[in-house]
């Protein structure tokens, strides 16, 4: 018959559009040779898995590339990682491990995934006081971003004399040489993560003294 | 106590056919993958044939492909291998094993001999 | 097809001896490794599947590992029931190949 086990924490997870989120699982430390297998990340009531560690298995189109098993079995490890997180991943998931000779395998319980808005938003730095004709280096950061993410795109709007400087994954510097008139004037970050199609931006105002 | 008991091997001629039959008790048969494994003379394991629990899904290693048949009939709790063209090389004892993608039990084996 | 390559292909040791065992595969096949010991005349037997689970009823001095390509069996301290030949197979894609064995023989 079809073994139960029951995934450890708590019974949903909360991500933010863009974002990333992973759902622990760990294989039954009890696990007969003959069940196993291949493991599957299943949506709730669909057949085509989301993520799979099988090479003959597709998975979903809409989660391609952003679902991720991480398997390994000498540590039990059969959690789901997900990343750039869309509204439509909002449902409830269970892990299947599963060898296709077999009529029965190992499933999991479920666990719900709850895909928020973006609420984060990006942090200006500006080192020191902005003078007019002396540049300055201001950087953007979303440090919350996630590393195994799509690396967002970042824009600068400013009516002042600007050029980019370097960017990190998850920064972008901004050189800034302000005049006398783009005192008061705004200046905004805006970041799109991509591979969730969502936009994030902070708005501020410049101080040229 | 889990069972696995071949039969029908024997001597043939090259090119003639034999049927390999594996008796299983001690489980539910019909949930299991089945495979069968063959060892030459003196040499290593070679993995032959792997048949899904109900039959719907068969693999073969390349050196019997278009030869050999695996099948199974649940309903009598046992595993068959039809061997047609046979050659010298297929001469081994053949084993019936019990697993999915990890076998855990064997039978003894039956030994099949190809001369002429 | 995943061809699977053990080494040595014989080896001569003592009782209580740590003896280990290496199999590589020529792509990789994540975990889905096992191990089988085989004595003259009789059936293969599982010993590890998964690479490092260890199958019900096997003694705690043998262990696996690896991951990807690379695999080892150990046998931490040698009993005299162990001589005999160990395979390595590979359950990642079928064909489910099998290693060309490693006689393990009394010094």
């Known amino acids: 018959q079809e073994r139960r086990f029951q995934l450890e924490g708590p019974e949903s997870l909360t991500v933010q559009e863009g974002l990333c989120v992973l759902v622990p699982c760990r294989l039954p430390t009890t696990l007969p040779a003959s069940y196993y297998g291949y493991g599957y990340w299943f949506l709730e009531g669909a057949d085509v898995p989301v993520a799979t560690n099988d090479p003959d298995e597709e998975v979903q189109e809409e989660t391609r590339g952003r679902f991720h098993l991480l398997w390994d079995p000498r540590r039990k490890n059969c959690s789901l990682s997900i990343r750039d997180a869309r509204r439509r991943d909002n449902a409830a998931y269970f892990f299947r491990l599963k060898s296709k000779w077999m009529k029965y395998g190992y499933t999991s319980s479920k666990l719900s995934v709850r895909v928020m808005a973006l609420t984060h938003r990006p942090k200006i730095l500006i080192p020191g006081t902005l003078e007019p004709g002396h540049s300055k280096n201001l950087t953007c950061s979303v440090s919350w971003a996630c590393e195994q993410g799509t690396p967002p795109i970042f824009s600068w709007l400013s009516a002042a004399p600007t050029s980019l400087g370097p960017r990190t994954t998850h920064s972008s510097v901004l050189i800034i040489t302000p005049r006398p008139q783009d005192h008061g004037t705004n200046l905004t970050c805006q970041v799109k993560f991509a591979g969730a199609g969502v936009t994030t931006e902070r708005t501020i105002q410049l101080n040229v003294t | 106590e889990v069972q696995l008991l071949e039969s029908g091997g024997g001597v043939v001629q090259p090119g003639r056919s034999l049927r390999l039959s594996c008796a299983a008790s001690?489980?539910?048969?019909?949930?299991?993958?089945m495979h069968w494994v063959r060892q030459a003379p003196g040499k290593g394991l070679e993995w032959v044939a792997v048949?899904?629990?109900?039959?719907?899904?068969?693999h073969y290693a390349d050196s019997v492909k278009g030869r050999f048949t695996i099948s199974r009939d649940n309903s009598k709790n046992t595993l068959y291998l039809q061997m047609n063209s046979l050659r010298a090389e297929d001469t081994a004892v053949y084993y019936c094993?019990?697993?999915?993608?990890?076998?855990?039990?064997w039978g003894q084996g039956t030994m099949v001999t190809v001369s002429s | 097809d995943i061809v699977m390559t053990q080494s040595p292909s014989s080896l001569s040791a003592s009782v209580g001896d740590r003896v280990t065992i290496t199999c590589r595969a020529s792509?990789?096949?994540?975990?889905?490794l096992n191990w089988y010991q085989q004595k003259p005349g009789k059936a293969p037997k599982l010993l590890i599947y998964?690479?490092?689970s260890l199958q019900s009823g096997v003694p705690s001095r043998f262990s696996g590992s690896g991951s990807g390509t690379d695999f080892t069996l150990t046998i931490s301290s040698l009993q005299p029931e162990d001589f005999a030949t160990y395979y390595c197979?590979?359950?990642?894609?079928?064909?489910?190949?099998f290693g060309q064995g490693t006689k393990l023989e009394i010094k």
């Open positions: 094993a019990r697993g999915g993608q990890t076998i855990d039990i």
């Open positions: 001690g489980f539910t048969f019909s949930s299991y993958g």
């Open positions: 048949i899904s629990y109900d039959g719907s899904n068969k």
């Open positions: 792509q990789s096949i994540s975990s889905y």
């Open positions: 998964a690479a490092s």
């Open positions: 197979q590979q359950s990642y894609s079928t064909p489910y190949t």
